[in-house]
Amino acid sequence: LIIGFGISGRHSITVTTVASAGNIGEDGILSCTFEPDIKLSDIVIQWLKEGVLGLVHEFKEGKDELSEQDEMFRGRTAVFADQVIVGNASLRLKNVQLTDAGTYKCYIITSKGKGNANLEYKTGAFSMPEVNVDYNASSETLRCEAPRWFPQPTVVWASQVDQGANFSEVSNTSFELNSENVTMKVVSVLYNVTINNTYSCMIENDIAKATGDIKVTESEIKRRSHLQLLNSKAS
């Protein structure tokens, strides 16, 4: 969490941003809140990016003002206009790409004063893993697949029965570049699996951590997946 204040004491307002991550090929949200004003026409929101000459987005007098917008962001940005009055200056970014990563500044002007806060925005790819029993294998084998990751993640297997065991010797992980030549498909195979046990396939990079669990008994197979973003720090 980053909390920024205006420069001149009495005329400063609190602006708060949260470091976040964007999944490339989807819309992303850059979070920013501020002390609200009672009059929408008195609020100015400017989003800037370090190293970019033009503005990322500007909202003033109750509407978008995009004449100074940088070409890189043309047609891709929006604030939640109906929520500005309650202090939400968050930015929606369409079709996030790797190049959108960087340091952004949320700069606010209201009748109470000015304030700003920086936000670190990471971009990458992350997806839910799916763990299945590989019936084609000669021994009891589990196969963990996740379609899109970037940067290259680490993959670790764990088991409920053998807690703390190191499965690196009995697993094999491969990374296959996807057609857009950025993200990769993750495939990890775990050998010598025992029945009546819960196994977890944990995939992690500096942006996200995802876990796929599978419980194999003689009568049924139960699966569960979970994904968590790692870098949500507020400023």
Epitope: N23, I24, G25, E26, D27, H57, K63, D64, L66, R74, G75, R76, T77, A78, V79, A81, D82, R92, K94, N95, A125, S127, P147, R148, N178, S179, E180
Partner: antibody, heavy 116, light 109 residues
């Protein structure tokens, strides 16, 4: 040249299924938001479905649960699987690329007629 | 659900005249996510304007877009014979993800 070419339309009975294809050239389908948009005879444009660059999908309420959008990255091709077809699904179906700032590339359209 | 209402439904003008087409949204739309398309009979739509006011590649400068919030306008400063067609506005970002207006037919007077 950047191009989209649809195929797979035709005459189908109510309740039937059809799969539309959209072959792309000159750009990579998986880097863009790819859409299906339809136009009933004499009517306006109606958005049907999107597949994001990430592979996630979204649908108009009118087709949710009946239509499935997908893509084959190796073939650079977009698909629309249409099941439980109804008379009101009769339309010209266009695939369109949204290159961040609007649907800038459209196919020529393929006609789907649902009639008994 | 955001509804886009275009007016007039039909606009009858002569070549050389100025055309003003309106698109009104039922709730606020980001200027970035507002586009205009032209469609001629038997053809696919063509992107004219994106981001409410930016001309798409290859679009003549007689076409211009303006507006913000809930009111957007497409202006054709001097009508050419090839400009007579149906025009649609479209928004992105709400549910449904994309919404089109019902269209304005620009016909020769």
């Amino acid at each position: 040249e950047v191009q989209l070419v649809e195929s797979g339309g035709g005459l189908i009975q109510p309740g039937g299924s059809l799969r539309l294809s959209c072959a792309a050239s000159g750009f990579i389908v998986s880097r863009n938001y790819m859409n299906w948009v339809r136009q009933a005879p004499g009517k306006g444009l109606e958005w049907v479905s999107v597949i994001y660059g990430s592979g996630r999908t979204d649908y108009a309420d009118s087709v949710k649960g009946r239509f499935t959008i997908s893509r084959d990255n190796s073939k650079n091709t977009l698909y629309l699987q249409m099941n439980s077809l109804r008379a009101e699904d009769t339309a010209v179906y266009y695939c369109a690329r949204d290159a961040d700032y609007g649907m800038d590339v459209w196919g020529q359209g393929t006609t789907v007629t649902v009639s008994s | 659900e955001i509804v886009l209402t275009q007016s007039p439904g039909t606009l009858s003008l002569s070549p050389g005249e100025r055309a003003t087409l309106s698109c009104r949204a039922s709730q606020s739309v980001s200027s970035s996510y507002l586009a205009w398309y032209q469609q001629k009979p038997g053809q696919a739509p063509r992107l004219l304007i994106y981001g409410a006011s930016s001309r798409a590649t290859g679009i003549p400068d007689r076409f211009s877009g303006s507006g913000s919030g809930t009111d957007f306008t497409l202006t054709i400063s001097r009508l050419e014979p090839e400009d007579f067609a149906v025009y649609y506005c479209q928004q992105y970002g709400s549910s449904p993800l994309y919404t089109f207006g019902q269209g304005t037919k620009l016909e020769i007077k």
